[in-house]
């Protein structure tokens, strides 16, 4: 009569997280007397998973009725599998002993691999807004997946990006893994409606990748262009001057009119018009009473956009000339740039 053998027919078992794992084990003999125990891992640090003799193992159920005298099937089911359950499981026959049972024979082991889905990718952009032509970084993170193999891609408006770096942690064996990727994106003036997408593909997703998105509207700042023009005379002694504020984003904008350097009026952009590219236009006008001025008047449209340093554009209104004879787009003062910061 040959000796008892502990047979674990499955070298490996693959289970999706949340499912039930069946670990098979049979003994070839009813003797020796003594219980079966299941362990995860081998050696002194092994973890007891199930003891036929005693203990409470709420996640474990036996496939057969172990109380039956002739039972030789010691297979178990472990419910609600998580990545932390991954490892090699051993079915071990013990010999009844006093004070403790004595380990007699072990099965060859069954490696339990857990397939766990990655979490939804979270894409985050820079803390501060940036202007077109600048390069900004976006990060994408996904956690809790297993096995380690995973593919991550970046897209901007459907076009795949190539300038990114990706890390999967940890490098060694683990119950589950995390991915972290940083992509560099060059902003353009047309990016208000743009989206950056991080796409993660994993064996558990059955060809349906997970996506995380970031709207560039939360990242970009498009500074306005200013144009100050003099409109035809509304009355004999009045001139209407407009300040066209074009192509700005976001909407937060404050405009101040200055006459010869003195604040005339301040207003906040409200009834703006939106362009197709998502930027905004706004117009403000100032009615200037020419008869109130003896000398030429320097009108300045000063705009503070989204908390940034103010930009301005000036227009010289010549009092000596008849208003009707003023050009509709008088050149700004001769001192230089039409658009400059005011401090």
């Amino acid at each position: 009569e040959e000796e008892l053998q502990v047979i674990q027919p499955d070298k490996s078992v693959l289970v999706a997280a949340g499912e039930t794992a069946t670990l098979r084990c049979t003994a070839t003999s009813l003797i020796p007397v003594g219980p079966i125990q299941w362990f995860r891992g081998a050696g002194p640090g092994r973890e007891l998973i199930y003891n036929q003799k005693e203990g409470h193992f709420p996640r474990v159920t036996t496939v057969s009725d172990l109380t039956k005298r002739n039972n030789m099937d010691f297979s178990i089911r472990i419910g609600n599998i998580t990545p932390a359950d991954a490892g090699t499981y051993y079915c071990v026959k013990f010999r009844k002993g006093s004070p403790d049972d004595v380990e007699f024979k072990s099965g060859a082991g069954t490696e339990l691999s857990v397939r766990a889905k990655p979490s939804a990718p979270v894409v985050s952009g820079p803390a501060a807004r940036a202007t077109p032509q600048h390069t900004v970084s976006f990060t994408c993170e996904s956690h809790g997946f297993s096995p380690r193999d995973i593919t991550l891609k970046w897209f901007k408006n459907g076009n795949e990006l190539s300038d990114f770096q990706t890390n999967v942690d940890p490098v060694g064996e683990s119950v589950s893994y995390s991915i972290h990727s940083t992509a560099k994106v060059v902003l353009t003036r047309e990016d208000v409606h743009s989206q950056v997408i991080c796409e993660v593909a994993h064996v558990t997703l059955q060809g349906d990748p997970l996506r995380g998105t970031a709207n560039l509207s939360e990242t970009i700042r498009v500074p306005p262009t200013l144009e100050v023009t003099q409109q035809p005379v509304r009355a004999e002694n009045q001139v209407n001057v407009t300040c066209q504020v074009r192509k700005f984003y976001p909407q937060r904008l404050q405009l101040t009119w200055l006459e010869n350097g003195n604040v005339s009026r301040t207003e906040t952009a409200s009834t703006v018009t939106e362009n197709k590219d998502g930027t905004y236009n706004w117009m403000s006008w100032l009615l200037v009473n020419v008869s109130a001025h003896r000398d030429d008047v320097k009108l300045t449209c000063q705009v503070e956009h989204d908390g940034q340093p103010a930009v301005s554009k000036s227009h010289d209104l010549k009092v000596s000339a008849h208003p009707k004879e003023q050009g509709s787009n008088t050149a700004a003062e001769n001192t230089g740039s039409n658009e400059r910061n005011i401090y």
Partner: antibody, heavy 118, light 107 residues
């Protein structure tokens, strides 16, 4: 026919070491657990050490632990007992026994005498 | 450890006699008991296992009985070759323990 032949016994001084061997034949040695059992002169029998068929698990009763080590070489059909720190009370006939399933001993060798004396 | 008390320690009998040797365990050993025979300078020989099952090749005059803590070896008609020392062994649990032996001598 099952045959178990012990060797390696002899006279050894207290504190000394000895290695006993058991040559097995007539059965598939690698399929069976084995044990060493001893019998002191005029005394009863006691199990010294037990090993399973592949050598992965061994058992030594509490009073033997640490001093006696059982091992096997299935390729050579041989069982061994390494005895260290020997004492006068270890003087006995040492038997090699086939021990299927760590149950009862179904076949025994003739024994080898170990005498521990100065 | 389980104590095995064997009695008698020695016994004189004649060829043809019916002989009974008993073994008492300090606790229930669930019939996990074996009997074996030893002659001077010879290897012990297993006669009975699981309290009452005869090993192949062992003469039918040998029989075993008992359960719980009390077990008996009976030789129904002693033969000259039966004069030897007999031991019981419990293998219900580790460590396995032996009775101290019964020496069967010719009267």
């Amino acid at each position: 026919e099952v045959q178990l032949v012990e060797s390696g016994g002899g006279l050894v001084q207290p504190g000394g070491s000895l290695r006993l061997s058991c040559a097995a034949s007539g059965f598939t040695f690698s399929s069976f657990s084995m044990s060493w059992v001893r019998q002191a002169p005029g005394k009863g029998l006691e199990v010294v050490a037990t090993i399973n068929s592949d050598g992965s698990n061994t058992y030594e009763p509490g009073n033997m632990k640490g001093r006696f080590t059982i091992s096997r070489d299935n390729a050579k059909n041989s069982l061994y007992l390494q005895m260290n720190s020997l004492r006068a009370e270890d003087t006995a006939v040492y038997y090699c026994a086939r021990d299927p399933n760590w149950d009862y001993f179904d076949f025994w060798g003739q024994g080898t005498l170990v005498t521990v004396s100065s | 450890d389980i104590q095995m008390t064997q009695s008698p320690s020695s016994l004189s009998a004649s060829v043809g006699d019916r002989v009974t040797i008993t073994c008492k365990a300090s606790q229930d050993i669930n019939s996990y008991l074996t009997w074996f025979q030893q002659k001077p300078g010879k290897a012990p020989k297993t006669l009975i296992y699981r309290a009452n099952r005869l090993v192949d090749g062992v003469p039918s005059r040998f029989s075993g009985s008992g359960s719980g803590t009390d077990y008996t070896l009976t030789i129904s008609s002693l033969q000259p070759e039966d004069f030897a020392t007999y031991y019981c062994l419990q293998y219900d649990e580790f460590p396995r323990t032996f009775g101290q032996g019964t020496k069967l001598e010719i009267k």
